[in-house]
Structures are given as C-alpha cells and as structure tokens.
C-alpha cells in the first residue's frame, strides 16, 4: 500500500491573539474506528511533539487538559486549533495521522504548515 | 499492509559481529525513512541507526558511530544493520521501523515512526 495520504494548507498566519486554526485531512484507506492525530513542530531539523489526541469516529478529540491545542473531527477532518502561540513559535507544523483501530494499522504524515506568528506591537502609552 | 520482518539477532561474545536484517513489504512509496531502533529492558526504545531511501542519507547514534554501519538493497526492499566490536551495552531487541516522510520532513527523526517489526533478540555476553 501507498503511504495514507494526509492533506493540510502550506501555510497559516497567527492571529494577533497568538491563534492559528488549519485542517488536517487524511484519506482512509480503510473504515477506522480509533485514530490518534498528532501536531509535530520541525524547525530547524528539529521535531517536537506540541499535541496528541485519540478519538473514535463520530465523537470528539481530547487533549490533555494542559495542552495548547483544541480540535474537532467530522469524517476524515480534523479541525485543529493551537492558542498561546508566539514569535518564537513559528514554524513548520505537521499533522500525523494514525489509524489505530481496527487494524491493519496505517500512518500517515502531513507535508506541514508553516504557521507564522508575529508578537503585537504594545500599545503606546496614552495621554487620555 | 506494511510488513517488517528482522533476523539476524542472537548471542555473541563481546568484541564478537552481528549482521541484522530487515525485510520490508507492503509499501509502496519510494520516499521513506528506515531503520534500526533498540529497547533494553527498563529503557525506552532508542534509535540506533537509519537511512533515508532516497539519497542514502544515515543517521547514527554516538554510541554505535564507528562500530556499526547501515546499508539498503533497494531491489530486495531490505536495509542491513552490521554490528562490530559489540559491547554488553549493546544487548537490547532490536527493531526495523519505518517513517513514510516526504523531502520536507527531517531525516530519520523518532516522531516520524509508527511502522514497526517484531523484533530481534540480540545478547552481547560471555
């Protein structure tokens, strides 16, 4: 079999709050029941993990309570929210998809989305 | 269905050679990262060594640089692992895993992974 495909937009600019949304979307080669997505940040050959969630088919993602990223699925969709995000934060994200159940097992990994993110200039201080 | 079959593992006295094998089938892409990763028992899995199909280039961890060399036979869809001046260290089970990337992605990077084989057993002892 050929690798899963998995489709997200090249490139998404941060909102002046430091929000960046994309779509993560992937061909299932089969009719998966449990998938795991996960959000990798490569920037300079380097690759971190930002966010992980498992879901069943039909209901919602759950990140972990701390993690910076919210989502929600539809089909073979997932919407992906990441907040708190900062200058220093940009980079290349890439979405890895999992087909975790039932098996056979299949893998695919996005080509990324360059997220540019650019810190507000502060306020000048008012007269008023 | 991707498949990764290993061989070559066993016991070997230290300073001994060992020769790993990895077959793959089932994918058909020709962009792909394949390689070697160890799990000695309480420790987490490590890479080891691995090669990208397309370019060659390899990856090695600081603690087998010099000792072991991995290569790829693309025609046979397998890559080779050979192990030389091998240390207790050493023992662990050794995994073929591979990484559908794409030139974007950064060569042999963990996170990339998923796909993986059985395993082979390989003792390092006197």
């Known amino acids: 079999c050929k690798a899963m495909h998995v489709a997200q937009p090249a490139v998404v600019l941060a909102s002046s709050r430091g929000i960046a949304s994309f779509v993560c979307e992937y061909a299932s080669p089969g009719k998966a029941t449990e998938v795991r997505v996960t959000v990798l940040r490569q920037a300079d050959s380097q690759v971190t993990e930002v966010c992980a969630a498992t879901y069943m088919m039909g209901n919602e993602l759950t990140f972990l309570d701390d993690s910076i990223c919210t989502g929600t699925s539809s089909g073979n969709q997932v919407n992906l929210t990441i907040q708190g995000l900062r200058a220093m934060d940009t980079g290349l994200y890439i979405c890895k998809v999992e087909l975790m159940y039932p098996p056979p097992y299949y893998l695919g990994i996005g080509n990324g989305t360059q997220i540019y993110v650019i810190d507000p200039e502060p306020c000048p201080d008012s007269d008023f | 269905e991707v498949q990764l079959v290993e061989s070559g593992g066993g016991l070997v006295q230290p300073g001994g050679s060992l020769r790993l094998s990895c077959a793959a089938s089932g994918f058909s892409s020709d962009y792909y990262d394949i390689g070697w990763f160890r799990q000695a028992p309480e420790k987490e899995r490590e890479m080891v060594s691995c090669?990208?199909?397309?370019?060659?280039?390899?990856k090695y961890a600081d603690s087998v640089k010099g000792r072991f060399t991995i290569s790829r036979d693309n025609s046979k869809n397998t890559v080779y692992l050979q192990m030389n001046s091998l240390r207790a260290e050493d023992t662990a089970v050794y995994y073929c895993?591979?990484?559908?990337?794409?030139?974007?992605?950064?060569?042999?990077?963990?996170?990339?992974?998923?796909?993986w084989g059985q395993g082979t057993r390989v003792t390092v002892s006197s």
């Open positions: 895993g591979l990484a559908p990337i794409s030139p974007v992605h950064a060569v042999c990077n963990q996170h990339y992974f998923g796909y």
């Open positions: 090669i990208r199909s397309s370019g060659g280039s390899t």
